[in-house]
């Protein structure tokens, strides 16, 4: 369970792939589309508000039923819209929703080598946001394999300004 309804902290950042392609968001036909693309040099990167929440780790060894904490994150590129996992379609979508956010909007944050991050679905452990055919998709990762596969690695470039939604 998430340890509180409020995030412990928030930050504004641009999101790019391991290969430095930008994650961009475009309003099309009253819904948002997510793209993975090479940005022209003069084009500004899209910002995402990351809200970080603590979640108790279910215990397998300690007697008190919890075993430390995980860090969960929600990603919002524009007011009232959040990235959500669609596990049936293996897709990542932007949906307008009100708080409390659904579980599909929460991702376990994994720090990776070279200061990259990965986002694991709260609703489907072992499934990560990844890049497939220039789009974001949900990708199943075998834990026995190296989780460093490049298509689930992302770079966060923090934008140090007031951490509120951009409109």
């Amino acid at each position: 369970s998430i340890t509180g309804i409020s995030p412990i902290t928030e930050s504004l950042a641009s999101l790019s792939t391991y290969n430095d392609q930008s994650i961009t968001f475009a309003l099309e036909d009253e819904s948002y589309e997510i793209y993975v693309e090479d940005l022209k040099k003069d084009k500004k990167k899209d910002k995402v508000l990351l809200s970080y929440y603590e979640s108790q780790h279910p215990s397998s060894e300690s007697g008190d039923g919890v075993d430390g904490k995980m860090l969960m994150v929600t990603l919002s590129p524009t007011k009232d819209f959040w990235l959500q996992a669609n596990n049936k379609e293996h897709s990542v979508e932007l949906h307008k929703c009100e708080k409390p956010l659904p579980d599909q909007a929460f991702f376990v944050l994994h720090n990776r080598s070279f200061n990259c991050v990965s986002f694991e679905c709260k609703t489907d452990p072992g499934v990560f946001i990844g890049v497939k055919d220039n789009h974001l998709a949900l990708i199943k990762v075998d834990y026995s394999e190296n989780l460093g596969s490049e298509n689930i690695l992302f770079k966060l470039s923090e934008i140090l300004e007031h951490h509120h939604h951009h409109h």
Partner: antibody, heavy 122, light 107 residues
């Protein structure tokens, strides 16, 4: 109760080797990244090495690269630091530390062992 | 690498005082900063993480604030057991780096 207990420190000559161990209990060891942090006498703290869980990615401070090797045995709930080609400047108390968050280093270290002293001297 | 500079390096204070320790980062980040307390011959103890979140079991007289490059640890109503050395640590990016420490001594 979370416990981290280091062992294996001692007096060693320059160029010598030591293997430090850190026995962990009270949490699911395999789920958490673990680190070694050292503190030279009268000095501050320095992250020496870190071992992530998934994918097993490792970090080494530039000052120890090629000489120290971090490893873990999840079946024994134990973290190791193999120290080779030791130098006088490696003299320090070595602490093992548990990552606050299971999959992220953002929270720092929430539990530390009591430390084991490594003295490199002829 | 992000360098962390703590000030002052030492401070003399009395029981009941308010003590403020600052930590400056060589490059900015949002809030992934931790504060530790260390007593002679003991391991460091986590007090604050994510710049302002109080670690479980730590008294509420300890508080943290800041973002970007400037962070602060404040101890209100200093107690005898608070005389120790305090370290900040940036947990934003590898290598995770510590400040040089601030020793809080009895006046």
């Amino acid at each position: 109760e979370v416990q981290l207990v280091e062992s294996g420190g001692g007096l060693v000559q320059p160029g010598g080797s030591l293997r430090l161990s850190c026995a962990a209990s009270g949490f699911t060891f395999r789920s958490f990244a673990m680190s070694w942090v050292r503190q030279a006498p009268g000095k501050g703290l320095e992250l020496v090495s870190d071992l992530r869980t998934s994918g097993g990615s490792t970090y080494y401070a530039d000052s120890v690269k090629g000489r120290l090797t971090i490893s873990r045995d999840n079946s024994k709930n134990t973290l190791y630091l193999q120290m080779n080609s030791l130098r006088a400047e490696d003299t320090a108390v070595y602490y093992c530390a548990k990552s606050h968050y299971s999959t992220s280093w953002f929270g720092g270290f929430d539990y530390w062992g009591q430390g084991t002293l490594v003295t490199v001297s002829s | 690498d992000i360098q962390m500079t703590q000030s002052p390096s030492s401070v003399s204070a009395s029981v009941g005082d308010r003590v403020t320790i600052t930590c400056r980062a060589s490059q900015g980040f949002s809030s992934w900063l931790a504060w530790y307390q260390q007593k002679p011959g003991k391991a460091p103890k986590l007090l604050i993480y994510a710049a302002s979140s109080l670690q479980s079991g730590v008294p509420s007289r300890f508080s943290g604030s800041g973002s970007g490059t400037d962070f602060t640890l404040t101890i209100t109503n200093l107690q005898p057991e608070d005389f120790a050395t305090y370290y900040c640590q940036q947990a934003n990016s590898f290598p995770l780096t510590f400040g040089g420490g601030t020793k809080v001594e009895i006046k």
